[in-house]
């Protein structure tokens, strides 16, 4: 999938951490569709 | 050690495409993401987006996202990333860095220098 | 986006000085925000995460503060290898985003 950031957006990330994705695990899975 | 090794310097005509190739080593690859960043010739550090390796999900500055196409090869554990459309204010040096979560882009390549010239 | 102002943009200081780089951002990025070295011709180099944090391998001699939207970069006695150019640049959310850079020259 891909995101697209640069535009003005809410965010509702906690304080204590950062809102970037992160690391990835090979744990991740793709969402389906 | 961690190494992160980009292709040599190009040179096209505006309207072009370039691909610009990061090999990374001394780490595993699949770990962290890869970001690219370019920097125009007496200017700043614009960060152009990044790509995961595993998912290869992407997330873009919206000001490139029409024209980048960022991609990966994990068998080699290299990042590419090739910008379309090229015009001569892309003449830049281009970096990959691998971005942690914790510390941001914690290692760079060496750049790679493109120039866009008639 | 957030925008980061660094100031200021060029400064001239000698070997054995203390200098302080800020970084002010547009809003609060809590507590993330990296340095970066740069000198001609070279790729950026990570000195300082998390606002604070020292990178593995940079001398003590450099130190970030700060939190929210006002941080600081202080070299406590200069060194001849440490006149280059200064980049803030945060990482709390997406877009990520340098500052303009500090431009350090040996007066």
């Known amino acids: 999938s891909e995101t697209t950031t640069g535009t003005s957006s809410n965010s509702s990330q906690s304080t204590s951490n950062s809102g970037l994705a992160p690391n990835p695990t090979n744990a991740t899975t793709k969402a389906a569709g | 050690q961690v190494q992160l090794v980009q292709s040599g310097a190009e040179v096209k005509k505006p309207g072009a495409s370039v691909k610009v190739s990061c090999k990374a080593s001394?780490?595993?690859?699949?770990?962290?993401?890869m970001g690219w960043v370019r920097q125009a010739p007496g200017q700043g550090l614009e960060w152009m987006g990044e790509?995961?390796?595993?998912?290869?999900?992407?997330t873009f500055n919206q000001k490139f996202k029409s024209r980048v196409t960022m991609t990966r090869d994990t068998s080699i554990s290299t990042a590419y990333m090739e910008l379309s459309r090229l015009r001569s204010d892309d003449t830049a040096v281009y970096y990959c860095?691998?971005?942690?979560?914790?510390?941001?882009?914690?290692?760079w390549g060496q750049g790679t220098t493109v120039t866009v010239s008639s | 986006d957030i925008q980061l102002t660094q100031s200021p943009s060029f400064l001239s200081a000698s070997v054995g000085d203390r200098v302080t780089i800020t970084c002010r951002a547009s809003k609060s990025i809590s507590k993330y925000l990296a340095w970066y070295q740069q000198k001609p011709g070279k790729a950026p180099k990570l000195l300082i995460y998390?606002?604070?944090t020292l990178h593995s391998g940079i001398p003590s001699r450099f130190r970030g503060s700060g939190s929210g939207t006002e941080f600081t970069l202080t070299i406590s006695s200069l060194q001849p290898e440490d006149f280059a150019t200064y980049y803030c640049q945060q990482h709390n959310e997406y877009p990520i985003i340098f500052g303009q850079g500090t431009k350090l020259e040996i007066k």
């Open positions: 001394g780490y595993d690859f699949t770990g962290y993401h």
């Open positions: 860095a691998r971005r942690d979560y914790g510390t941001s882009l914690d290692y």
């Open positions: 790509i995961n390796p595993i998912t290869s999900d992407k």
């Open positions: 998390a606002g604070s």
